[in-house]
């Protein structure tokens, strides 16, 4: 909501999840794993690379299946706590200027730092209006303090916010799952928020330097090397 | 149960108001987008308009634009909707119906929406 | 505005037959559709929804599939109760939410 669309394959490491349609965004972190939300779990699922339009074949895209989809232990469905979800492709996807991994953080998201969030989802806070050209915004990433007063009781330590207090710039339905990038690195996930776009009602995201430690060993756990004694 | 109970059928002249309510039970009212649906004699549905019943934002439909009014009172968990300056084509049936998209906490996955629910309808005559 | 087209009009089937409804968008509306039912003097009731899923309570008889602009009911074995008339609705580009025309399945 109140985005712009991206230039052309600019965000290169933005997947959509499909299953039949786009349903969820994703972020992807090496040549055959994406993360993405939690909540966008279903038992299969095509992940699309080097998506722009959507709706149109463009000849960048990279259309894999999923082989594994693997969801934090700890995920919450009623507080959307650990709202983490990873994807192992069934096959490597090819790496190219327009499909390319994004780099995990190497320190905790910093208010006032700003960031891209990326999606297919809705652009109106009232209604709806699903795009099929990705959609950008630029949002800074707001205090622990006043993501805490917006949403009193409901912010773990693995969520964060960003966007604008006065509202009218937000990611929306659709965009779940997908990338809050800063720096060059995958800061936040697409999660939850109340409406879309609200006054006092910012974007809450998962904070993905909480999970590095569970990314890199489920990762290491689902990767087939095999030892010979 | 989960039910939406609308007000008794009206007759009005051309020219007059009506108002219609539509009163949630069963759920938390305020969770859920209240759209009012109205049909001719004979004819299909035709959407109206939506209200938020969380913040009483509403969308309306052009052709009702400056004719119709969606309101709530959500202390008695009820959604109103008025239309006016009355003429003998708004002789219709008209429903209210929700939207099960949680307005509160609302994860950013893709939401199917439907008119899981419908109110009973209310026939409105519009004669002279 | 998003056009909703149903065809055919009415449709004449046979109990027991299988009945297929078409409902068919001017523009891409992803997979956000219904479809409900509607009896005369009755207001309608949801069947399907998003393009494919069962509504709470609906029988396994009636199926939902298509995505983007063609869109397909199926009702695989016609009971005397499922003789009303359908409407598809679209929920991908609001407002205003459009529905089709409604497609009336008669006892043949």
């Known amino acids: 909501v109140g985005g712009y669309i991206c230039e052309e394959n600019s965000v290169p490491y933005q997947v959509s999840l499909n299953s039949g349609y786009h349903f969820c965004g994703g972020s992807l972190i090496s040549e055959q794993w994406v993360v993405s939300a939690g909540h966008c779990y279903k038992s299969r699922i095509q992940v699309r690379l080097g998506e722009h339009n959507i709706e149109v074949l463009e000849g960048n895209e990279q259309f894999i299946n999923a082989a594994k989809i693997i969801r934090h232990p700890k995920y919450n469905s009623r507080t959307l706590d650990n709202d983490i979800l990873l994807i192992k492709l069934s096959s490597p996807a090819v790496i190219n200027s327009r499909v390319s991994a994004i780099s995990l953080p190497t320190a905790p998201p910093a208010a006032g730092t700003e960031s891209l969030i990326s999606g297919w989802g809705n652009t109106l806070s009232s209604g709806a209006d699903y795009p099929d050209e990705l959609q950008c915004l630029d949002a800074p990433v707001l205090s622990q303090a006043e993501c805490e007063a917006s949403y009193p009781g409901k912010i773990t330590n693995n969520m964060f916010c960003v966007g604008f207090l006065e509202g009218g710039k937000d990611s929306c339905q659709g965009d779940a799952g997908g990338p809050v990038v800063s720096n060059g690195e995958l800061q936040g996930i697409v999660s939850w928020g109340y409406g879309c776009a609200q006054k006092n009602r910012p974007g809450v995201y998962t904070k993905v330097y909480n999970y590095v430690d569970w990314i890199k060993d489920t990762i290491a756990a689902n990767s087939h090397h095999h030892h010979h004694h | 149960q989960v039910q939406l109970v609308q007000s008794g059928a009206e007759v009005k002249k051309p020219g007059a108001s009506v108002k219609v309510s539509c009163k949630a039970s069963?759920?938390?009212?305020?969770?859920?987008?209240m759209h009012w649906v109205r049909q001719a004699p004979g004819q299909g549905l035709e959407w109206m308009g939506s209200?938020?019943?969380?913040?009483?934002?509403?969308n309306y439909a052009q052709k009702f634009q400056g004719r119709v009014t969606m309101t709530r009172d959500t202390s008695i968990s009820t959604a109103y909707m008025e239309l006016s300056r009355l003429r003998s084509d708004d002789t219709a049936v008209y429903y209210c119906?929700?939207?099960?998209?949680?307005?509160?906490?609302?994860?950013?996955?893709?939401?199917?929406?439907?008119?899981?629910?419908w109110g009973q309808g209310t026939t409105v005559t519009v004669s002279s | 505005e998003i056009v909703m087209t149903q065809s055919p009009a009415t449709l004449s089937v046979s109990p027991g037959e299988r009945a297929t409804l078409s409902c068919r968008a001017s523009q891409s509306v992803g997979s956000n559709l219904a479809w409900y039912q509607q009896k005369p003097g009755q207001a309608p009731r949801l069947l399907i929804y998003?393009?494919?899923t069962r509504a709470t309570g609906i029988p396994a008889r009636f199926s939902g599939s298509g995505s983007g602009t063609e869109f397909t009911l199926t009702i695989s074995s016609l009971q005397s109760e499922d003789f009303a008339v359908y409407y598809c609705?679209?929920?991908?580009?609001?407002?205003?939410?459009?529905f089709g025309g409604g497609t009336k399945v008669e006892i043949k």
């Open positions: 609705q679209q929920f991908h580009n609001w407002p205003p939410l459009t």
């Open positions: 998003g393009a494919s």
């Open positions: 119906a929700r939207d099960p998209v949680l307005l509160l906490r609302q994860q950013r996955i893709l939401h199917e929406s439907a008119f899981d629910i």
């Open positions: 209200i938020n019943p969380s913040s009483g934002g509403t």
């Open positions: 069963g759920y938390t009212f305020t969770g859920y987008y």
